[in-house]
Each structure stands twice: as C-alpha cells, then as structure tokens.
Interface confidence: low
C-alpha cells in the first residue's frame, strides 16, 4: 500500500476518504486506527456501527467521526478541530473476525493556520504553481506522498 497524504489546517476539520471494493468488503465493519511507530501496532481510534446495516450512521470518538457508504464503497473519517498532535500515520481497515485488512494507509498532515502567522504586511497568497514544498495547499487535500512528511508520532 502506498501512503496517501491528507492535509488539513490546524483548528479546522479534515475529511479523509478511503475507497474500497464494496463487493469484496460486503458485510464487513470498518475501522480507523493510528499507527504507533514504524513497526508497532495500529491502535483503534473509532469503528463503524456494530450492526453493518447501520454503518451509514456516524459514530464518534472524541473529535474523530466515522461513517461508511457500503453501497458506494467509501469510508469517510472526519477529524474535527485538527491539532498538531493529530499529525501522523493512520490506516483505514476492513474488519473480519479478529483480522483486519488495510484499505488505505494515510498520512495526516497538519498545517499551521496562516491567519495565526500573519505578517505585518499583506497576507501572502500562494501562486498557482505554489506547493507545500510544491503542493497546492487546500483544506482536506489528498495526494500520494509526494511532498512533505511527518514521521511517526512519538510513542513515549
């Protein structure tokens, strides 16, 4: 699995989407977990409804919510009030018994809110070719891991 980057702005919401084959994963609950260290376990953050047929209902754990479009095959995770400590590696998982298949590896990147770092002069707006280190900075943008990186969150 390649890693997909989702960028969000500190203090705002970030929506992470994980597409999957709806037939292959029919009847399976889904989960969102945080990778603890490079070789460590993936710690469950939130999972979809216990009843698969109710997976469309939003479930929440703190500032993280999850909902599953089982027909369309898209798992959506929303991180509210994004904070720097939310940055790190995560996984979308499909659960079957005690096993979990990885649907997508995700790197969440938290950008400083430009308004919190405004210069005395005019607010600088990036040009069209601007990048986060060359990547367009938008809310909730996702891409392959081409620019920018955040190491695994500290485990201590």
């Amino acid at each position: 699995h390649n890693t997909t980057v989702f960028q969000g702005v500190e203090g705002q919401s970030l929506q992470v989407s994980c597409p999957y084959d709806s037939m292959k994963h029919w009847g399976r609950r889904k989960a969102w977990c945080r990778q603890l260290g490079e070789k460590g376990p993936c710690q469950r953050v939130v999972s979809t409804h216990n009843l698969w047929l109710l997976s469309f209902l939003r479930r929440r754990n703190g500032s993280t919510a999850i909902t599953d479009d089982t027909l369309g095959g898209t798992l959506t995770i929303t991180l509210r009030n994004l904070q720097p400590h939310d940055a790190g590696f995560y996984q979308c998982q499909s659960l079957h018994g005690s096993e979990a298949d990885t649907l997508r590896k995700v790197l969440v990147e938290v950008l400083a809110d430009p308004l919190d770092h405004r210069d005395a002069g005019d607010l600088w707006v990036p040009g069209e070719s601007e990048s986060f280190e060359d990547a367009h900075v938008e809310h909730s943008i996702s891409r392959s891991l081409l620019e920018g990186e955040i190491p695994f969150p500290p485990t201590s």
Epitope: A112, V137, L146
Partner: antibody, heavy 123, light 112 residues
Framework: QVQLVQSGAEVKKPGASVKVSCKAS????????MNWVRQAPGQRLEWIGR????????NYAGKFQGRVTITADTSASTAYMELSSLRSEDTAVYYC????????????????WGQGTLVTVSS | DVVMTQSPDSLAVSLGERATINCRSS???????????LHWYQQKPGQSPKLLIY???NRFSGVPDRFSGSGSGTDFTLKISRVEAEDVGVYYC?????????FGQGTKLEIK
C-alpha cells in the same frame, strides 16, 4: 546517532550509468525524505531529487528528469541514486542528505549528509 | 526555479572580527503556511556540507551561538559575530520552500 554512509568512488565512460548507494542508520529511515545533491568541481551544490522511502514517492529536479532514478530499500535502510547517459559535466561529488521534518513547519532542512561519492566521467 | 544569489563571493576577515554574508532569492520564500524555509550550510575544505541555520534564524544543534541568521521574504543574512580559525570554508544559503530546492553559489570565508 544518525549516520549516512555512501558507496565508493566510481569512474565511468560517457554514455554509461552509475548507481550510488547511501546506507542510513540511527533513525526511522522510511519516515524521512532522503535527498540527493551533487557538487561539480568548483561549483555550487545542486539538488537532484528526493525519495520518501515509506511510500517510494519521488521528486526530481527538471534538469535530471528522465535521466535519474532514485529508489530505496527500506529493509536495508538504503537509498540509491542512478544516473544514466553520463557525460563529462556529470563529474561531481554526489551526496545523500536527510531532510528533517519533525512537525509541520519544523525544518525542511538537510540536517545530516553522507560523506560524498566522487563520480568521474571520462573517456 | 528559485534562484539564490549570495554576496560577496568571498571575504577575508581577521580572527575575532565579524563576518556578514548576504543571500537574495528571486522570489519570496514565505510558504503558504507562513514559514520561511531558508537555511544556511557550512562546508569546510574536503568535507560534506553541515547544517548551520534552518528556517532563517534557528541554530541547528551543536552550532555555536556566534552564528546567527536573519531576514525575511527575499533577503537574508548570516552573521558570524567573532570569526574563529575553524570557521574557514564555504557558506551556502538554500531554500526548501519550493521544489526544486536550490542553493546559492557559495561564499568563501578566509582568515586575514
């Protein structure tokens, strides 16, 4: 402590290819970008490209696009830079350098460098 | 690409004196996240470059406090308050706000 150890000097003929390796230790190799930078005799440092070992994703400077391939073997914590269709102007010391990025906005600077690999292109 | 231009190309300073190196970029190095990714590297004869200053003014670990960086936008300065013999070498400014990363042509520091 962080260490980057590069392969030895190479002498190549024009038109040939060269592959330089960079073995990393002392940090989580797969979660920091690795850059390649070269320095021709008496010239400024020149950025070639970089790789994110955890995903295999790469960026290259336009000047080298199509002629350079940067790869990484996470199991061996080693990055590679292969340059093809060599010409005399490619004679330079080639460096690998880790790009530090601990948190958003933290650094994006090359904090540790390999010892350099001299590549000489001569007929 | 962002072009980095340093001045002077070389300078000779007496031990204990102050050295100032300037760096100008062809476009603003302020990133859309408001940070400025301008760094300074030192390369001693026969050695690999070493990171001195990152993000304009932050000294890298182990770098003596006689080294300081300043500037904003497109104009930046590296100062060595009291030059020591071990400071001899070439100093490069570099930007990582935009890919491709680019370096200045270098400033050679010598002792008078």
């Amino acid at each position: 402590q962080v260490q980057l150890v590069q392969s030895g000097a190479e002498v190549k003929k024009p038109g040939a290819s060269v592959k330089v390796s960079c073995k990393a230790s002392g940090y989580a190799f797969s979660s920091q970008w690795m850059n390649w930078v070269r320095q021709a005799p008496g010239q400024r440092l020149e950025w070639i490209g970089r790789i994110y070992p955890g995903g295999g994703d790469t960026n290259y400077a336009g000047k080298f696009q199509g002629r350079v391939t940067i790869t990484a073997d996470t199991s061996a914590s080693t990055a590679y830079m292969e340059l093809s269709s060599l010409r005399s102007e490619d004679t330079a010391v080639y460096y690998c350098a880790r790009l530090l990025r601990n948190q958003p906005g933290e650094s994006y600077a090359m904090d540790y460098w390999g010892q350099g690999t001299l590549v000489t292109v001569s007929s | 690409d962002v072009v980095m231009t340093q001045s002077p190309d070389s300078l000779a300073v007496s031990l204990g004196e102050r050295a100032t190196i300037n760096c100008r970029s062809s476009q603003s190095l302020v990133h859309s996240n408001r940070y400025t990714y301008l760094h300074w590297y030192q390369q001693k004869p026969g050695q690999s470059p070493k990171l001195l200053i990152y993000k304009v003014s932050n000294r890298f670990s182990g770098v003596p406090d006689r080294f300081s960086g300043s500037g904003s936008g497109t104009d930046f300065t590296l100062k060595i308050s009291r030059v020591e013999a071990e400071d001899v070498g070439v100093y490069y400014c570099s930007q990582s706000t935009r890919v491709p990363y680019t370096f200045g042509q270098g400033t050679k520091l010598e002792i008078k």
